[in-house]
């Protein structure tokens, strides 16, 4: 069967997010991907969306991320814009209203996004073959 258009959009957004570092990409996020052994794919996507929402809600106005120049401010705004897009599409793919996020280890945002990209690419290769 054909791949969901949402999945393609997620991969595109993840590519944009992982190509460049910003002041915020070294900050930590709850690493639900490391603790997703006994969860369904939909639950994993739902939890990923949840922790991403927690991240950007917490750091959207974080002065460490906004930086000292208009250039850094612009990059942070772009980062937040992409994270919101990713969050929205992950909810669409998950098809769940809510999901519990247990206490877990922390990962940098950039590592989390790289691993999420790997997961999404694997899913895409399966559905496109």
């Amino acid at each position: 069967h054909k791949c969901d258009i949402t999945l393609q959009e997620i991969i595109k957004t993840l590519n944009s997010l992982t190509e460049q570092k910003t002041l915020c990409t070294k900050l930590t996020i709850t690493d639900i991907l490391a603790a997703s052994k006994n969860t369904t794919e939909k639950e994993t996507f739902c939890r990923a969306a949840t922790v991403l929402r927690q991240f950007y809600s917490h750091h959207e106005k974080d002065t460490r991320c906004l930086g000292a120049t208009a250039q850094q401010f612009h990059r942070h705004k772009q980062l937040i814009r992409f994270l919101k897009r990713l969050d929205r599409n992950l909810w669409g793919l998950a098809g769940l209203n809510s999901c519990p996020v247990k206490e877990a280890n922390q990962s940098t945002l950039e590592n989390f996004l790289e691993r999420l990209k790997t997961i999404m690419r694997e899913k895409y290769s399966k559905c496109s073959s």
């Epitope: 944009s16 190509e19 460049q20 208009a70 250039q71 401010f73 705004k77 772009q78 980062l79």
Partner: antibody, heavy 123, light 106 residues
Framework: QLQLQESGPGLVKPSETLSLTCTVS??????????WGWIRQPPGKGLEWIGS???????DYNPSLKSRVTISVDTSKNQFSLKLSSVTAADTAVYYC???????????????WGQGTMVTVSS | DIQMTQSPSSLSASVGDRVTITCQAS??????LNWYQQKPGKAPKLLIY???NLETGVPSRFSGSGSGTDFTFTISSLQPEDIATYYC????????FGGGTKVEIK
């Protein structure tokens, strides 16, 4: 296709203010994902970034020129402008306007440039 | 301010030769480095962005590599139309251009 066109006087007297305008056609200057810059090149020399302006109106300037530079935007005219005060012969250069940023990336290089306008500072 | 040191300042090579230009940043700039080509009387043209990505429509003989502080720009087989000055530019923290490398045909 987006195009940029610089305009302004080709000759400015020392100690006066150099004023240039860049008109953007084929696209909106108001997009959140893009920003706009000025770069100059003295005759036979290299490129020097002057400053940039973002959709919010916030600006960054080259520290070496900061005290003399003002960049502003007029969204109604789809234009942005450069003012450089107290000019000397060292400000004689080709002045370029350019677009930076991208809708599908966190940031991007200055990828679209105007053809440049020569400004001579002389009495 | 981040300084960009580009070398050589000029070079002469034969058509078909492999040409290499280097650029060194005074501090870590990650992959926020671009390469531009400028022909006499023309505006600079973006060739490579983020150290190694080829801008759309640019011939594949142009390539870039590097990360951190050391970067390389390569023309795999020099063509007559490649005669120009090439500039590196960092945009990790504001913007700084290298001094340029003038490429001529032997």
């Amino acid at each position: 296709q987006l195009q940029l066109q610089e305009s302004g006087p080709g000759l400015v007297k020392p100690s006066e203010t150099l004023s240039l305008t860049c008109t953007v056609s084929g696209g909106s200057i108001s997009s959140e994902s893009y920003y706009w810059g000025w770069i100059r090149q003295p005759p036979g020399k290299g490129l020097e970034w002057i400053g940039s302006i973002y959709y919010s109106g916030s600006t960054d300037y080259n520290p070496s020129l900061k005290s003399r530079v003002t960049i502003s935007v007029d969204t109604s005219k789809n234009q942005f402008s450069l003012k450089l005060s107290s000019v000397t012969a060292a400000d004689t250069a080709v002045y370029y306007c350019a677009r930076g940023g991208a809708s599908d990336r966190i940031d991007h290089a200055f990828d679209i440039w105007g053809q440049g306008t020569m400004v001579t500072v002389s009495s | 301010d981040i300084q960009m040191t580009q070398s050589p300042s000029s070079l002469s090579a034969s058509v078909g030769d492999r040409v290499t230009i280097t650029c060194q940043a005074s501090q870590d700039i990650s992959n926020y480095l671009n390469w531009y080509q400028q022909k006499p009387g023309k505006a600079p043209k973006l060739l490579i962005y983020d150290a190694s990505n080829l801008e759309t429509g640019v011939p594949s003989r142009f390539s870039g590599s590097g990360s951190g502080t050391d970067f390389t720009f390569t023309i795999s087989s020099l063509q007559p139309e490649d005669i120009a000055t090439y500039y590196c530019q960092q945009y990790y923290d504001l913007y700084t251009f290298g001094g340029g490398t003038k490429v001529e045909i032997k």
